[in-house]
Amino acid sequence: KESCDVQLYIKRQSEHSILAGDPFELECPVKYCANRPHVTWCKLNGTTCVKLEDRQTSWKEEKNISFFILHFEPVLPNDNGSYRCSANFQSNLIESHSTTLYVTDVKSASERPSKDEMASRPWLLYR
């Protein structure tokens, strides 16, 4: 008999290399039985995971699995980092493995900023 626990299928040490300025959808695969759980995304900041409140999310339902999607429209350099989805189910909190976004700043790659600009915008060095 299949377990009716909620399961979050983000692979351990999963990562995505993405470009700033373009959209991206970060998917949290969710398996559940009857009632869809309440799922949230958070971003890791050291040992704490900060809940992403004002971000666009949606559900995509497929036959055997659902996806809770965090939308980046578009990806920003500040989106670089690790994310985790969590599900509340029957007063239990289930947390996924973290998934890491590596953001490449296409503007810095194409425009080759000056030393002064690099000093004032150190985030250009992400990749």
């Epitope: 373009d22 971000r55 429209e73 920003l76 350099p77 500040n78 296409v106 915008r121």
Partner: antibody
Framework: QVTLKESGPALVKPTQTLTLTCTVS????????VHWIRQPPGKALEWLGV???????SYNPSLKSRLTITKDNSKSQVVLTMTNMDPVDTATYYC??????????????WGQGTLVTVSS | EIVLTQSPATLSLSPGERATLSCRAS?????MHWYQQKPGQAPRPLIY???NRATGIPARFSGSGSGTDYTLTISSLEPEDFAVYYC?????????FGQGTKLEIK
């Protein structure tokens, strides 16, 4: 310098399809997104959609079924197609460049706009 | 859809006075942009991401706020500041604008 210029018909008939072209200079369509925004006479601004640098699009859900945005990187052109035009679609249509900073995204350079009147 | 409600719809002030324009969002947004539009012209960026002045915008313009409540302040009005001001959110598609506040000379 950065410029965007809209071109297309000033007058279209109801039920017809509107095609507007945005020709840009001073930046690459592979690095920056281009948005379409409209403004009916005396009214507020309405975001229609965007062509992202990588070639994907996003649309205003209320108009998605009527809109198509395409681009030609080599010609530095972005094209808006809007089907089944109605008199309520009479507006000034702007193409606008989108740009990101470290932690926000905004529209910085605007075209002059082109007034499209829908009337029989 | 996030609805942005600007108040007042019209603000009548004299040059030298302080103008305070409000924008309230129907749901929390990460930040707010502000644009200025003069008759017959395209909007121009004024304030990015709540409080960052766009290139060439004088220091008399400032922005503040968080969550659902945002404010644009013009500390001392110059004759060229009389225009329509729009707030704009880029947190959730559709990316909406307020209905505008018309700043007119008293």
């Amino acid at each position: 310098q950065v410029t965007l210029k809209e071109s297309g018909p000033a007058l279209v008939k109801p039920t017809q399809t509107l095609t507007l072209t945005c020709t840009v200079s001073g930046f690459s369509l592979t690095t920056y997104g281009v948005h379409w925004i409209r403004q009916p006479p005396g009214k507020a601004l309405e975001w229609l959609g965007v062509m992202w640098p990588g070639g994907r699009t996003s649309y205003n859900p209320s108009l998605k079924s009527r809109l198509t945005i395409t681009k030609d990187n080599s010609k530095s052109q972005v094209v808006l197609t809007m089907t089944n035009m109605d008199p309520v679609d009479t507006a000034t249509y702007y193409c606008v460049r989108g740009d990101y900073e470290y932690d926000y995204y905004a529209m910085d350079y605007w075209g002059q706009g082109t007034l499209v009147t829908v009337s029989s | 859809e996030i609805v942005l409600t600007q108040s007042p719809a019209t603000l009548s002030l004299s040059p030298g006075e302080r103008a305070t324009l409000s924008c309230r969002a129907s749901s929390s947004v990460s930040y707010m942009h502000w644009y200025q539009q003069k008759p017959g012209q395209a909007p121009r960026p004024l304030i990015y991401a709540t409080s960052n002045r766009a290139t060439g915008i004088p220091a008399r313009f400032s922005g503040s706020g968080s969550g659902t409540d945002y404010t644009l302040t013009i500390s001392s009005l110059e004759p060229e500041d009389f225009a329509v001001y729009y707030c704009h959110q880029w947190s959730s598609n559709p990316y909406t604008f307020g209905q505008g506040t018309k700043l007119e000379i008293k």
